[in-house]
Amino acid sequence: MASTGLELLGMTLAVLGWLGTLVSCALPLWKVTAFIGNSIVVAQVVWEGLWMSCVVQSTGQMQCKVYDSLLALPQDLQAARALCVIALLLALLGLLVAITGAQCTTCVEDEGAKARIVLTAGVILLLAGILVLIPVCWTAHAIIQDFYNPLVAEALKRELGASLYLGWAAAALLMLGGGLLCCTCPPPQVERPRGPRLGYSIPSRSGASGLDKRDYV
């Protein structure tokens, strides 16, 4: 019963992690730059994401532009895009695998097989969480590096966007969910021999005669 609860908790966290990853990867809030206008007032804020950049004016008006050319994008951005998509697909696969092997479903009858399926799902979700972490941490590192780089103009120094924080949270949820699914897996039990401890194995009688133990009084 406790393992069923852990499974449900793990899957819930993984679903939240998947949704968080989806939102984080989709939103253009990876890098944020504020441009100061006349009278030291923030005139524009530029948001940059994996798929588009947006400019938000002081009036509140926002305009976004989707990156039209893949070739014009830096390689790290292309890699971040790819990792995000792979992580989303992998997490989805992990969730589907987890549902297949969950205690509360009857897709698989064999308990041992169920345990192995849930363990596989946990590993997949852990991997998905790591894949989300890579572009998020890489982008954060680049922003911080630029911030302390004297060759980068003050006006161009970016801040960490909300998508990065959301990405960290999503990665944590995926990994936590995956970890819990791995923990629900009972340790492999050594089967006790049915007969006396002998140095050789006794062939199964039921296999030879077609009779079961229940046939004996």
């Epitope: 730059t33 441009f35 206008g37 006349n38 005139a43 524009q44 530029v46 940059e48 588009m52 950049s53 400019v55 004016q57 008006q61 305009q63 532009k65 990156y67 039209d68 050319s69 070739l71 014009a72 994008l73 830096p74 390689q75 951005l77 630029d146 060759l151 980068v152 103009a153 161009l156 970016r158």
Partner: antibody, heavy 124, light 107 residues
Framework: QVQLQQSAPELARPGASVRMSCKAS????????MHWVKQRPGQGLEWIGF????????EYNQNLKDKTTLTADKASSTAYMQLTSLTSEDSAVYYC?????????????????WGQGTSVTVSS | DIVMTQSRKFMSTSVGDRVSITCKAS??????VAWYQQKPGQSPKLLLY???TRHTGVPDRFTGSGSGTDYTLTISSVQAEDLALYYC?????????FGAGTKLELK
Amino acid sequence: QVQLQQSAPELARPGASVRMSCKASGYTFTTYTMHWVKQRPGQGLEWIGFIIPSSGYTEYNQNLKDKTTLTADKASSTAYMQLTSLTSEDSAVYYCARQFSLITTGFGYALDYWGQGTSVTVSS
Amino acid sequence: DIVMTQSRKFMSTSVGDRVSITCKASQDVSTAVAWYQQKPGQSPKLLLYWASTRHTGVPDRFTGSGSGTDYTLTISSVQAEDLALYYCQQHYSTPLTFGAGTKLELK
């Protein structure tokens, strides 16, 4: 400080080709996009195109696309522009200019540092 | 292509005057407008970008404003060294386009 040093003036015959250079210093060459701008005598500014030195990706003004080839050498932090099939219309000062913004694509095409210009005169 | 129109080719002014140079875009450029100053025999120099953000080292007498399609560069108190050609440019999308320029000259 940031400097863009352009090559010497060119005198060319109609139909010939010229290749000019723009050597960048004082910043990380591969981080910023390099643009080229044309200015005919007594006229305004006309954008030619840009090159992203890190990837070699180029984008051109459709009106000048067939005439221009932009390249960049990361090792020497130098951008190049080749003009082919020269006519009197190509007599102008050509500037290389660094894109100010690091914004990946869209919105950020202001040009903060400009070379001193390379004068091209096409005459028979 | 986005067309940038500077309606006035020349503007006469005196030292100490306040002067405004206007620029109109053929479509909404979402404040992605830069202003350049060019003196004879020199290359253009970036003054403002994002319509109102001053570039490093630009005196605060240069201010910019505008949104949508209409943009203005204002020099609050013209100095002798400000007599030059001023170009607006949209940095919204490629192909980048410039206005024809407005020459600021003494009365």
